[in-house]
């Protein structure tokens, strides 16, 4: 942009430098230049010369009107046409810039990721502003009422150390630019109640010799939250459908999960988890993927009456991904598998 | 109880620089976000810039890429460097708690006069 340029004259934008898309908008500009009566001022906008709406003020001054101004930064520039001289004058530049005033920032969550030592918030921005916005992350302790805010630009991290005085806090968001001001919800936040434990990792798997073959999934994390559940999901490489199956955890030791599966065919499991009873869930787990062993003797495989889970199983779920170009977005089938038979019900979303 | 000493305001030439600084006691410093407001004659107030207890910052259009605000937590103290300043700029200029917003809390503030 024009950051810095010596004017020989002035150029100024009404509205102003910044404004709201699609606004009309006339930028001025008036020449002071030495030894020059100018023939003609002309404009120009990111280096391309202007040809239309250019109105002639006085002498000194013209000015050029655009209908509807929907771009997000132009620079602008005017010259004069001095007699006698081959080349056009610079008198003055500006950038400007259109855009929205931000929206209300909206699904505000904040979490604290166990041995992170931060309380971590993100939010929806809403629509794109196309112009500098800042958030402004309001932390009210309730038990104490001082207001801590920190400046962000998507999303915080908050030390745990500036959290000490108080267990329980209002927060919200403030989103400001040029062009306007808007604010969050607020979120109640227990800070006993936003941890999410420790990544919870798949280290490895293996198919038994027997009969019925069994595929044993090992898996841990090294959470110090005694209270787990858990769910983990796996379905063939092939497919699109994940079975989704809960546990609650005692990370202990080594969780073992015992599955019943096709044979000679290619898996895939994720784990996740949560506090139990509480509302935040780690991300899934970094796709594992298992190769069952060949089927030893002839069996009529049944994916509705084998036994699923030597563990206790709540319920076992199947999802279907959207889009074999986003695992981890996931929509849930109206059918839920518990006890073998198909049943409907609800089940929480995954992904 | 909270108090803030603005200081370093003066009668500089447009294009001239200044260093303001507000000394802060009876709150914990380093954790809070500051900001200056400033207020023209015959005007109302105006934010002009913020900074939280991480030292990231914020600035009105008016004073973008010509002020800067820093905060020193080992002396309590709020600062704003002001360069290449317009006659626009004349104002009284006040601290004040919080990153946004276009109040003060009553501190005496300092004048700064810009002209020729």
């Known amino acids: 942009g024009i950051t810095s340029i010596n004017c020989s004259g002035d150029m100024w934008v009404e509205p102003g430098e910044i404004f709201q898309m699609g606004m009309n908008v006339s930028i001025y500009c008036q020449e002071a230049l030495k030894h020059c009566r100018p023939r003609n001022l002309y404009f120009y906008k990111n280096g391309f010369k202007e040809e239309f709406d250019i109105t002639r003020i006085n002498r000194t001054t013209a000015r050029i009107w655009y209908k509807g101004f929907s771009e997000p930064h132009a620079y602008m520039h005017c010259t004069a046409e001095c007699p006698g001289h081959f080349q056009e004058t610079l008198i003055c530049g500006k950038d400007i810039s259109s855009g929205h005033p931000p929206d209300a920032p909206s699904n505000l969550t904040c979490v604290i990721y166990e041995y992170s030592g931060n309380m971590t918030c993100t939010w929806n921005t809403g629509k794109p502003t196309y112009i500098d916005t800042k958030y402004i992350v309001h932390v009210k302790s309730l038990e104490t009422e001082e207001e801590q805010q920190y400046l962000a630009s998507s999303y915080v991290k908050i030390s745990t150390d500036s959290l000490q005085g108080s267990r329980k806090y209002l927060v919200w968001v403030q989103a400001v630019n040029s062009l306007g001001m808007e604010n969050s919800q607020q979120l109640h936040v227990h800070l006993d109640d936003i941890v999410i434990p420790s990544a919870s990792i798949i280290s490895r798997a293996e198919t038994t010799n027997d009969t019925v073959p069994k595929t044993i999934v090992y898996w841990k994390s090294k959470t110090m939250i005694e209270k787990v559940f858990c769910e983990m999901r796996y379905k063939t490489t092939t497919n699109q459908t994940w079975s989704v199956k809960e546990f609650d955890a005692n990370f202990t030791y080594v969780q073992q999960s015992e599955f019943y599966l096709e044979p000679d065919s290619k898996y895939v499991f994720q784990v996740r988890c949560q506090e139990t009873g509480k509302r935040n869930w780690q991300p899934w787990s970094s796709p594992f993927v298992h190769q069952t062993s060949q089927e030893t003797g002839k069996r009529n495989w049944q994916p509705w009456s084998s036994p699923f889970v030597h563990q206790t199983s709540q319920t076992v779920s199947q999802v279907t991904a959207k889009s074999s170009h986003e695992p981890q977005k996931m929509e849930m089938l109206s059918a839920t598998i518990f006890r073998g038979h198909p049943a409907s019900g609800n089940h929480q979303d995954i992904g | 109880q909270v108090q803030l000493q603005e200081s370093g305001g003066g009668l500089v030439q447009p294009g001239g620089s200044l260093r303001l600084s507000c000394a802060a006691s009876?709150?914990?410093?380093?954790?809070?976000?500051m900001r200056w407001v400033r207020q023209a004659p015959g005007k109302g107030l105006e934010w002009v810039s913020g900074i939280d207890s991480r030292g990231s910052t914020i600035y009105a259009d008016s004073v973008k890429g010509r002020f800067t605000i820093s905060k020193d937590n080992a002396k309590n103290t709020l600062y704003l460097q002001l360069n290449s300043l317009k006659t626009e700029d004349t104002a009284m200029y006040y601290c004040?708690?919080?990153?946004?917003?276009?109040?003060?809390?009553g501190s005496q503030g300092t004048q700064v006069t810009v002209s020729s």
């Open positions: 009876g709150f914990t410093f380093r954790l809070t976000a």
């Open positions: 004040a708690q919080g990153v946004y917003g276009d109040t003060y809390s």
